[in-house]
C-alpha cells in the first residue's frame, strides 16, 4: 500500500507569546512545527515515529494564520507519506517551538524552546473529507485539518489495491475509485484484454484483435464469419461447413461442374423434338416424323421414301412432296397408267400382263430387272445386306458379302470365335456383340441361349409395330422387335429413314 | 508446469534471415492468459525485448526491429516463431522464448533456456 | 524511444539491504517488473506490477515504483543473491528492459 496523512495548520494563537515554561519570548515567539505521526497508542509515548515524522520552517509570531500555500520552502498542507497499508488508527504529536535562529531550517538552531504541543488518538478512515480540529491550553490554540489519502495509482480502503491505468496489449482499461478496473470501450475480459468482436461476429468461425473487428478463422468467409468456404472450385454448390460442395440441383460431380440436366440448361433438342437427360452432359433427342440428326435439326427429304412410282420424279414441297408422272401415268404417286400392252410398256425382256380387262398392265420382269416397268437394274447391294463392315459385290445375278477377319456368314453376321459354335438352341438367332454372343430367341423360347421353354409368350400381345418381326429370349418374359427398314424404336414405332443397328429390346 | 524450449540453427551467414521456433509443453499456447514473446542478449550485454504474439495472430514488435521482423504461430503444434531477416554481426546473441502473463502485468514468468545464434560468414 | 536507466553495479555485505533502482519518464505511471539472472541461466522474474512477487520468491524481495523511479529493494541479503538485476516496462505495446545493475 501507498499514501499520505495529510495536515493543515490553519491557525496558531499565543497571544501572550509565552513558552511553556512561563517565560515569554523576546521579542515575540518565532514559531515553527514538529509533527510525529505514528501507530495508535493508548498512552502516546516517546519513541520513534513509526508512520513518519516533519519539521515545519517559522510559519509567524505569536499568533497567525496559515495560509494553504508554499511557506518558505515548507509545504501546508504537511506530507507524511506511508508505503503499507493504512491501518485506519493513529496517534500525532503536534509540538509548537520558539527558535531564535534560522527561519528556514530552525531544526538545526540550537536554544530552541517549546512553546506547546497536542497530542490525537484515534481513527480516521481513507477519504478526501479533511476532519477539522481545535486544541486549546492555557496559553495556546490551534486550528488543524487532517486526513488520508491514497498515493497515485493505489485506491481502496486502506491504499492496498493498486491500480494503473493502461493501453496497451496487457490491458486497456482506468481504474475506479475502488481500484477496480473499468475497461474502455471495446475491451472486456478481467484484464480489458479481450477485444470486443464486431456485433454477430459469430463466436467460434470469428474472432478480433481490436474492438469491432471479425476475422475469419480458416473456412469461414462474410462480414461476420457465418459463411462457409465451398471446396475450391466448386461451381454449382454449396456448403454447410467448409470445404464441402454439395451440388445444386442438377449439376454433379466432385465440384458440382457436371451438367445433370443438361436438356433443361441448354434445351439442345430442335423442332419439337423430346429431350432424354443421360448422366453428366448426356442427353438424347428423340425426333418428330420428318426429321433427323443428333438434334432433330435435319429436317428429312419428303422425297426420302420414294413415294413416286412408275418412274415418277418427285419434288420437295413446303409439307409435301409432288410426283412428276412420266408419259401414260397419272394419280398422287403416278400409280394409274394409261397405257396398256399395246403400247409396248415393259423394258428389258419383261413380259405384260393385261389388268383390269385391258385398261391396265403389269410387267413381269427378267432376272436383274425391276420397277413396275422393268425399267431398273437390280443392284443387290443397295440394301447394305453386310454387316460387321462386310464388302458387298454384285456377282452378276446375285451379290456376296466379303466378310472382315473375324467374322463370316452369308452376310458377314457371325462372329466366327463366338457365333461359329452355333450357341443358340431351338432355332434361335446368334448375334455376335463386344461381350460375347447374344441370342435372338424364337417365340416360345427364352434364356441367354434359348434353352428355356416359356410358357408365356411375350410377342403373343402383338408388341411390334410397322411389321417388325417379335421374338423373345434375350431375358425372360421380354421381347424384341427387328425393325424393318425405315422404323426405329423399341418397339419400331418410330419412321426414321435409317437402318437399326440392333433390335430394340423392349 | 509449463516449458519453453528454442530449437534452429546456431549460425546464420550475414544478409540471411535467422529463423528460431519455440515449443511449448506443460500448457497450451491458445490461452488467452499469455503473450509469447521472442528477447535477446548479446554476448556480456542487456535484455532487448524483440516483439511477442497472441494466439489468434496479433503481433508486437519493438520498433526498432520491426522492419526484420516476423514472428507467428502455430497452435496446432504448440510452436511460435521468430524470423528476423537482413542479419548482421550486431544480432549475434542468446535468444530466448518466453512467455508473458496477462494476470502479471506483462511480466514474463517462464522463459526457454536460450539458444546461442551467431552470425559469420 | 522509452529508455530505462539503472546503475551498473550495486555492492552490498552479506545481511545488508540493497537497493537497486530504475529511472525512467513517468516511469511511476507504468507497472514495473524486476528479473533476476545469473551467469549462463535465464532470467528470473522476481517481481511484477511494481511490488506483487511471484510464488516461490522470497519476502527479503521487495519493490515500490512512483514518480520517475522504480527501486527494487534486497533486505538481508544473502549469497545466493549475486545476479544481475534487469527493471523492466511497457511503454505502449512495446517491452523495455532496463540496462541491468550487477549486484555483488
Known amino acids: 500500500g501507498s499514501g499520505i496523512f495529510q495536515l493543515r495548520l490553519q491557525e496558531f494563537v499565543n497571544q501572550r507569546g509565552m513558552l511553556a515554561n512561563g517565560q515569554s519570548c523576546e521579542p515575540g515567539c518565532r514559531t515553527f512545527f514538529r509533527i510525529c505521526l505514528k501507530h495508535f497508542q493508548a498512552t502516546f509515548s516517546e519513541g520513534p515515529c513509526t508512520f513518519g515524522n516533519v519539521s515545519t520552517p517559522v510559519l509567524g509570531t505569536n499568533s497567525f494564520v496559515v495560509r494553504d500555500k508554499n511557506s518558505g520552502s515548507g509545504r501546508n498542507p504537511l506530507q507524511l507519506p506511508f508505503n503499507f497499508t493504512w491501518p485506519g488508527t493513529f496517534s500525532l504529536n503536534i509540538q509548537a517551538w520558539h527558535t531564535p535562529g534560522d527561519d528556514l531550517r530552525p531544526e538545526t538552531s540550537p536554544g530552541n524552546s517549546l512553546i506547546s504541543q497536542i497530542i490525537i488518538q484515534g481513527s480516521l478512515a481513507v477519504g478526501k473529507i479533511w476532519r477539522t480540529d481545535e486544541q486549546n491550553d492555557t496559553l495556546t490554540r490551534l486550528s488543524y485539518s487532517y486526513r488520508v489519502i491514497c498515493s497515485d495509482n493505489y485506491y481502496g480502503e486502506s491504499c492496498s489495491r493498486l491500480c494503473k491505468k493502461r493501453d496497451d496489449h496487457f490491458g486497456h482499461y482506468e481504474c475506479q475509485p475502488d481500484g477496480s478496473l473499468s475497461c474502455l470501450p471495446g475491451w472486456t475480459g478481467k484484464y480489458c484484454d479481450q477485444p470486443i468482436c464486431l456485433s454477430g461476429c459469430h463466436e467460434q468461425n470469428g474472432y478480433c484483435s481490436k474492438p469491432d473487428e471479425c476475422i475469419c478463422r480458416p473456412g469461414w468467409q462474410g462480414r461476420l464469419c457465418n459463411e462457409c468456404i465451398p471446396h475450391n472450385g466448386c461451381r454449382h454448390g454449396t456448403c454447410s461447413i467448409p470445404w464441402q460442395c454439395a451440388c445444386d440441383e442438377g449439376w454433379g460431380g466432385l465440384f458440382c461442374d457436371q451438367d445433370l440436366n443438361y436438356c433443361t440448361h441448354h434445351s439442345p433438342c430442335k423442332n419439337g423434338s423430346t429431350c432424354s437427360n443421360s448422366g453428366p452432359k448426356g442427353y438424347t433427342c428423340t425426333c418428330l416424323p420428318g426429321y433427323t440428326g443428333e438434334h432433330c435439326e435435319l429436317g428429312l427429304s419428303k422425297c426420302a421414301s420414294n413415294p413416286c412410282r412408275n418412274g415418277g420424279s418427285c419434288k420437295d414441297q413446303e409439307n409435301s412432296y409432288h410426283c412428276l408422272c412420266p408419259p401414260g401415268y397419272y394419280g398422287q404417286h403416278c400409280e394409274h397408267s394409261t397405257l396398256t400392252c399395246a403400247d409396248s410398256p415393259c423394258f428389258n425382256g419383261g413380259s405384260c400382263r393385261e389388268r383390269n380387262q385391258g385398261s391396265s398392265y403389269a410387267c413381269e420382269c427378267p432376272p436383274n430387272f425391276t420397277g413396275s416397268n422393268c425399267e431398273k437394274k437390280v443392284d443387290r447391294c443397295t440394301s447394305n445386306p453386310c454387316a460387321n463392315g462386310g464388302q458387298c459385290q454384285n456377282r452378276g445375278p446375285s451379290r456376296t458379302c466379303r466378310c472382315r477377319p473375324g467374322f463370316t456368314g452369308t452376310h458377314c453376321e457371325l462372329h466366327i470365335s463366338d457365333c461359329a459354335r452355333s450357341p443358340c438352341a431351338h432355332g434361335g438367332t446368334c448375334h455376335d456383340l463386344e461381350n460375347g454372343p447374344v441370342c435372338t430367341c424364337p417365340a416360345g423360347f427364352s434364356g441367354r441361349r434359348c434353352e428355356v421353354r416359356i410358357t408365356h409368350d411375350a410377342c403373343a400381345s402383338g408388341p411390334c409395330f410397322n411389321g417388325a418381326t417379335c421374338y423373345t429370349g434375350l431375358s425372360p418374359n421380354n421381347f424384341v422387335c427387328n425393325c424393318p427398314y425405315g422404323f426405329v424404336g423399341s418397339r419400331c414405332e418410330f419412321p426414321v429413314g435409317l437402318p437399326p443397328s440392333f433390335p430394340w429390346v423392349a | 508446469e509449463v516449458q519453453l524450449q528454442e530449437s534452429g540453427p546456431g549460425l546464420v551467414k550475414p544478409s540471411e534471415t535467422l529463423s528460431l521456433t519455440c515449443t511449448v509443453s506443460?500448457?497450451?499456447?491458445?490461452?488467452?492468459?499469455?503473450?509469447w514473446g521472442w528477447i535477446r542478449q548479446p554476448p556480456g550485454k542487456g535484455l532487448e525485448w524483440i516483439g511477442d504474439?497472441?494466439?489468434?495472430?496479433?503481433?508486437y514488435y519493438n520498433p526498432s526491429l520491426k522492419s526484420r521482423v516476423t514472428i507467428s504461430v502455430d497452435t496446432s503444434k504448440n510452436q511460435f516463431s521468430l524470423k528476423l531477416s537482413s542479419v548482421t554481426a550486431a544480432d549475434t546473441a542468446v535468444y530466448y522464448c518466453?512467455?508473458?502473463?496477462?494476470?502479471f502485468g506483462g511480466g514474463a514468468d517462464s522463459w526457454g533456456q536460450g539458444t546461442l545464434v551467431t552470425v559469420s560468414s | 524511444s522509452y529508455e530505462l536507466t539503472q546503475p551498473p553495479s550495486v555492492s552490498v555485505s552479506p545481511g545488508q539491504t540493497a537497493s537497486i533502482t530504475c529511472s525512467g519518464d513517468?516511469?511511476?505511471?507504468?507497472?514495473v517488473s524486476w528479473y533476476q539472472q545469473k551467469p549462463g541461466q535465464s532470467p528470473v522474474l522476481v517481481i511484477y506490477?511494481?511490488?506483487t512477487r511471484p510464488s516461490g520468491i522470497p519476502e527479503r524481495f521487495s519493490g515500490s515504483n512512483s514518480g520517475d523511479t522504480a527501486t527494487l529493494t534486497i533486505s538481508g541479503t544473502q549469497p545466493m543473491d549475486e545476479a544481475d538485476y534487469y527493471c523492466?516496462?511497457?511503454?505502449?505495446?512495446?517491452?523495455?528492459f532496463g540496462s541491468g545493475t550487477k549486484v555483488t
Open positions: 513517468g516511469l511511476g505511471d507504468k507497472y
Open positions: 506490477e511494481d511490488s
Open positions: 523492466q516496462a511497457w511503454d505502449s505495446e512495446s517491452g523495455v
Open positions: 506443460g500448457g497450451s499456447i491458445s490461452s488467452s492468459n499469455y503473450y
Open positions: 518466453a512467455r508473458e502473463a496477462v494476470s
Open positions: 504474439i497472441y494466439y489468434t495472430g496479433s503481433t
